[in-house]
C-alpha cells in the first residue's frame, strides 16, 4: 500500500530542503528563508530555531537542517537540544535560588554546574583516606593494606580537617 501510494503521490519526490507546494500543483518548491525540511515529502517547511539572548548559534540553519544553539560564556546547556541555559558557578560552588554558593564543609563540586556532593567515604570500600577533600575536590581513597605491593603508594594518614576552600597544594 505504501509503495502504491508513493507512486501516486507526487509529494514523495520532493527532497529535503523543499516542500510540496499545494498552491502550485504540488510541485517541489525550495524552503523559504529561515525555514527547513530535514526529510523528503514534506508539505511544509519548519521555521528555523533562532538563538537569541543567552543562546548563541552553534550551527546555522540550512534548508535541510535546523539551527543548533548553545549558551553564551558563563552559562551552560540544560535539556534536550540545549532547550535552556543555566548560569555557571565556580568549581567549589553550587547554584542556588540566591546565586552561586560555596560548598559546605564535607562536600565538593569539581564542575561549573551541578550540586555539591558529599566526599567519598573511603571506609565503605575498606580503604583509607590518601588525600583529604576540599570544596573543589573529592577525597582520594588509598588501597587497603592488603592491596599494597612493592612499588605502590603507601597510605598516608588523613591530615587534620581543613577549612573549606583551602585547597592543598
Amino acid at each position: 500500500f505504501e509503495r502504491t501510494r508513493s507512486l501516486q503521490d507526487p509529494c514523495s519526490n520532493c527532497p529535503a530542503g523543499t516542500f510540496c507546494d499545494n498552491n502550485r500543483n504540488q510541485i517541489c518548491s525550495p524552503c523559504p528563508p529561515n525555514s527547513f525540511s530535514s526529510a523528503g515529502g514534506q508539505r511544509t517547511c519548519d521555521i528555523c530555531r533562532q538563538c537569541k539572548g543567552v543562546f548563541r548559534t552553534r550551527k546555522e540553519c540550512s534548508s535541510t537542517s535546523n539551527a543548533e544553539c548553545d549558551c553564551t560564556p558563563g552559562f551552560h546547556c540544560l535539556g534536550a537540544g540545549c532547550s535552556m541555559c543555566e548560569q555557571d558557578c565556580k568549581q567549589g560552588q553550587e547554584l542556588t535560588k540566591k546565586g552561586c554558593k560555596d560548598c559546605c564543609f564535607g562536600t565538593f563540586n569539581d564542575q561549573k554546574r551541578g550540586i555539591c556532593r558529599p566526599w567519598t567515604n573511603c571506609s565503605l570500600d575498606g580503604k583509607s583516606v590518601l588525600v583529604n577533600g576540599t570544596k573543589e575536590r573529592d577525597v582520594v581513597c588509598g588501597p587497603s593494606p592488603a592491596d599494597l605491593s612493592p612499588g605502590a603508594s603507601s597510605v598516608t594518614p588523613p591530615a587534620p580537617a581543613r577549612e573549606p576552600g583551602h585547597s592543598p597544594q
Epitope: 565538593f108 569539581d110 561549573k112 556532593r117 567519598t120 565503605l124 573543589e136 582520594v140 585547597s167
Partner: antibody, heavy 127, light 110 residues
C-alpha cells in the same frame, strides 16, 4: 585483568560516519567512568569524550562537540563512539580508556586517572 | 596548542635524574588532581602517577610526582634505557568541562 578491545576503525570519506566499539572485560564495567582518547599520527594524546555510569552524563572536547556521541551498554559491557561529519583532522588512533575509582562509592574519578587502556583502532578520514 | 604546557623533549644519561614540567592554570592544575602517563613507542599509554603524587601498584618508586600552584612535575631518578618514552600530564579542567592533556614530552636516554 582489565581488557579493552576497540573495533570499528577504518577508512572513511570526509563528511562520512563511523561507529567505534570497545568491548570491556575483567572489571565491573557498570561501575566506572569511560573515556575515548585519540592520537593523530606523530602527535600527542587528545581527550575526546567521557561518560559516567551512574547518571549517564557525557562530556566532549570542543573539537568534536555536536559531531560525536559517546554511549554505553552496561548489559553488554561495551562503550561506543558514534562519529558523524568526519573531517581529515579526525584521523587518529582512537583509544578506549577506563577511569579509576569505582562508582557509586567514589563520587569523582578525576583523581585516579585512566588506569586501563585498549590498544586502539585507527580511523582514517580521506577522500 | 595544548591547555597544559610541557617541554617537547627532555634527556638524561643512565642513572641520573630528570624532571618533566607541566604548566596549567587555576581552572585545571590549580584546583584539580594531576595524573601522568607513559607511552612507550608503538604501545598504548600507561598510568604512571595519580592524584598528583601517588603511584599505582607496580610502578617503580623511581617515578615521583609533585604539584605546586598551577604547575606539576614528574621526576624520574635512576634513569634507565627502558624509560625512553613519551610522557603526558593530564587533569580535569572545570571551565572546559573536560579532561585536558599536555602536549607530551619525549624523553631520550643518552
Amino acid at each position: 585483568e582489565v581488557q579493552l578491545l576497540e573495533s570499528g576503525g577504518g577508512l572513511v570519506q570526509p563528511g562520512g560516519s563511523l561507529r567505534l566499539s570497545c568491548a570491556a572485560s575483567g572489571f565491573t564495567f557498570s561501575g566506572y567512568d569511560m573515556s575515548w582518547v585519540r592520537q593523530a599520527p606523530g602527535k600527542g594524546l587528545e581527550w575526546v569524550s567521557v561518560i559516567y555510569p551512574d547518571d549517564g552524563n557525557t562530556y566532549y572536547a570542543d573539537s568534536v562537540k555536536g559531531r560525536f556521541t559517546i554511549s554505553r551498554d552496561n548489559s553488554k559491557n561495551t562503550l561506543y563512539l558514534q562519529m558523524n561529519s568526519l573531517r581529515a583532522e579526525d584521523t587518529a588512533v582512537y583509544y578506549c580508556a577506563k577511569h579509576g575509582g569505582q562508582k557509586p562509592t567514589t563520587k569523582s574519578s578525576s583523581a585516579y586517572g585512566m588506569d586501563g587502556w585498549g590498544q586502539g583502532t585507527l580511523v582514517t578520514v580521506s577522500s | 596548542q595544548s591547555v597544559l604546557t610541557q617541554p617537547p623533549s627532555a634527556s638524561g644519561t643512565p642513572g641520573r635524574r630528570v624532571t618533566i614540567s607541566c604548566s596549567g592554570s587555576s581552572s585545571n592544575i590549580g584546583n584539580n588532581y594531576v595524573t601522568w602517563y607513559q607511552q612507550l613507542p608503538g604501545t598504548a599509554p600507561k598510568l604512571l602517577i595519580y592524584a598528583d603524587s601517588h603511584r599505582p601498584s607496580g610502578v617503580p618508586d623511581r617515578f615521583s610526582g609533585s604539584k605546586s600552584g598551577t604547575s606539576a612535575s614528574l621526576a624520574i631518578s635512576g634513569l634507565r634505557s627502558e624509560d625512553e618514552a613519551d610522557y603526558y600530564c593530564a587533569t580535569w579542567d572545570y571551565s572546559l568541562s573536560g579532561y585536558v592533556f599536555g602536549g607530551g614530552t619525549k624523553l631520550t636516554v643518552l
